[in-house]
Amino acid sequence: GWVWNQFFVPEEMNTTSHHVGRLRSDLDNGNNSFQYKLLGAGAGSTFIIDERTGDIYAIEKLDREERSLYILRAQVIDITTGRAVEPESEFVIKVSDINDNEPKFLDEPYEAIVPEMSPEGTLVIQVTASDADDPSSGNNARLLYSLLQGQPYFSVEPTTGVIRISSKMDRELQDEYWVIIQAKDMIGQPGALSGTTSVLIKLSDVNDNKPIFKESLYRLTVSESAPTGTSIGTIMAYDNDIGENAEMDYSIEEDDSQTFDIITNHETQEGIVILKKKVNFEHQNHYGIRAKVKNHHVDEQLMKYHTEASTTFIKIQVEDVDEPPLFLLPYYIFEIFEETPQGSFVGVVSATDPDNRKSPIRYSITRSKVFNIDDNGTITTTNSLDREISAWYNLSITATEKYNIEQISSIPVYVQVLNINDHAPEFSQYYESYVCENAGSGQVIQTISAVDRDESIEEHHFYFNLSVEDTNSSSFTIIDNQDNTAVILTNRTGFNLQEEPIFYISILIADNGIPSLTSTNTLTIHVCDCDDSGSTQTCQYQELMLSMGFKTE
């Protein structure tokens, strides 16, 4: 049978041939009658055999990391017979390991992020090196990790490559660290090979800084003409944190006048001072307010860093603006009786310059021919007023500063013309009546009513009477209905068209004013020929039209 031991060849042997071992048949008596042959991949190129002795040699430098075993076939032939002495057999040549590979970090580059202020022992990242040498061959591939750079902030577990924090770090002082890790094989013993890797460790921000005003005092100005909502300036606090942790909210801490507000511009992280109420230089020309700033997001466990909010004082100066004259009232209402003579006093308006220089004021009335105003604001009439023409006047009074005629204010002034009893009552319309020749006594001829152009104080009351002459003629009589109307009745039986075709009746109408005014109004009554039913037969054309209910102009 075949005789051989396990074959090993060390890798990386530089000699031209290295004796691996010997193959032989136990039938071989050493008389050189046997011929040994090597077959298979590597036979003749990597390995050769001494045909006489069966000694195998490696003639090529081998790399275990490339290939760690070769399976070859062996034959032995009797030279004299040419026959196989032994059955063809397979054998294995193993390539034994030497420590010729340094550890390599295959997952480079390494980068890790860890929150600042993380406690000691916090895991940052695990780095792993690979060693191509045989892990089952001694310590060639047994690695130990150590820290070459990164103390005192980091440490590495020697056997696992786990990097941990060994000292708290403040991102605001340094936000990233380069740590260099070395991996040594042979568990660090002499002759070990090593490899290194760099780990970039970035500190992520935690909200361990509150925003702080760099300025303890801000000076701002606001024009007294600024409308509410005007931005009058910005204030700025600085937070050493970044991102969401640096977002802040500004607010008013003290503002007794409640004149200002602060809003936050979340894009620029500035505080914008806003005018909440209009200011008046003449009333108050400076203000002092206190503002505070806090972070927008604060975790409960980080509240210790945010106990007292940073504050700043803001002095706000009000800028004077040349303001137009200011009337004492927003509008005026005056009263004056009608029929008062030209130049009569109506009332006084008053405007002043609100500014400190107190410019004299000049007054004018816009488009009025009835009133006048002097430099004292006294309004007088330029004509006698008739309430029955105009009961109200709407005036526009303008006040102009003497020293700056561009500063103008206008207000409405309403003048009410008061009534006096200067109009007597009169017929509400023109009356023309008729009476039949055969009319009986007490027959109603006409109902009349009156109007008075004067304004009634409470309610007009008119009194109707016949004139003394008409009362004496006694053809007609009048009855006052006590409701501002009266009826005319016949006071006799029968009228004669030929003798007296027309009657003119004078009617007195008095009002209840003080003094009472009376007017005389004429009522025309035509006598007509009527039939038995009272329909007119013979009457002049005009009278006939009237009787039919038509009014002619």
Epitope: A41, D63, E66, R67, S68, I71, E88, K104, L106, A132
Partner: antibody, heavy 120, light 108 residues
């Protein structure tokens, strides 16, 4: 798991050089114990081994193609490449890259293959 | 160079049947150095068997390999529809690496 992907021109002119690259993902080309190989398959025919390379740069070629073949490796890019010079129509084939287990010689895994046509 | 001869060139069988594919080497090959592959149209070959008899990861147990020296066999105990493909043997025992010409397994 390791995956391989061939890339390169699908058409090459006769007498020119065919160049293909195989990109390895899911593992390192620098891992010991493996060769990185090229195999081709003529249309409708069997498989032909072209050659392989170890990450150290050591190469092994099929003697029938040795004079025209060059295989190289770029460990930084995790890639290996094939160059076949002086091509003729007979080099028209689907070219595969594959990983070879160096001790026992089987091919696993394979790339999906890329057809290279040699034509003017 | 070792020449691998596969037989038959084409094998026509029905699903459920047993398939036996042969690979003969022109010279002795270590069983450790023989592998079988399956290739479907438009796809790359897939490793089925290595070391003459060991199934690759994820290969169903209906596939088995045997043989030594110069004669090797791939057996599919019960054909499934997805098994119809071309099968190649490959050797690593001698340089250059060579493949058989393939056996086409088709549905009868």
């Amino acid at each position: 798991q390791v995956q391989l992907q061939e890339s390169g021109p699908g058409l090459v002119k006769p007498s020119q050089t065919l160049s293909l690259t195989c990109t390895v993902s899911g593992g390192s080309i620098s891992s010991g114990g493996y060769y990185w190989s090229w195999i081709r398959q003529h249309p409708g025919k069997g498989l032909e081994w072209i050659g392989y390379i170890f990450y150290s740069g050591k190469t092994y070629y099929n003697p029938s193609l040795k004079s025209r073949v060059s295989i190289s490796v770029d460990t930084s890019k995790n890639q290996f490449s094939l160059k076949l010079s002086s091509v003729t129509a007979a080099d028209t084939a689907v070219y595969y890259c594959a990983r070879v287990y160096s001790n026992y010689g089987w091919f696993d895994p394979w790339g999906q293959g890329t057809l290279v046509t040699v034509s003017s | 160079e070792i020449v691998l001869t596969q037989s038959p060139g084409t094998l026509s069988l029905s699903p459920g049947e047993r398939a036996t594919l042969s690979c003969r080497a022109s010279q002795s090959v270590s069983s450790s150095y023989l592998a079988w592959y399956q290739q479907k149209p438009g796809q790359a070959p897939r490793l089925l068997i290595y070391g003459a008899s060991s199934r690759a990861t994820g290969i169903p147990d209906r596939f088995s390999g045997s043989g030594s020296g110069t004669d090797f066999t791939l057996t599919i105990s019960r054909l499934e529809p997805e098994d119809f493909a071309v099968y190649y043997c490959q050797q690593y025992g001698s340089s250059p690496i060579t493949f058989g010409q393939g056996t086409r397994l088709e549905i009868k």
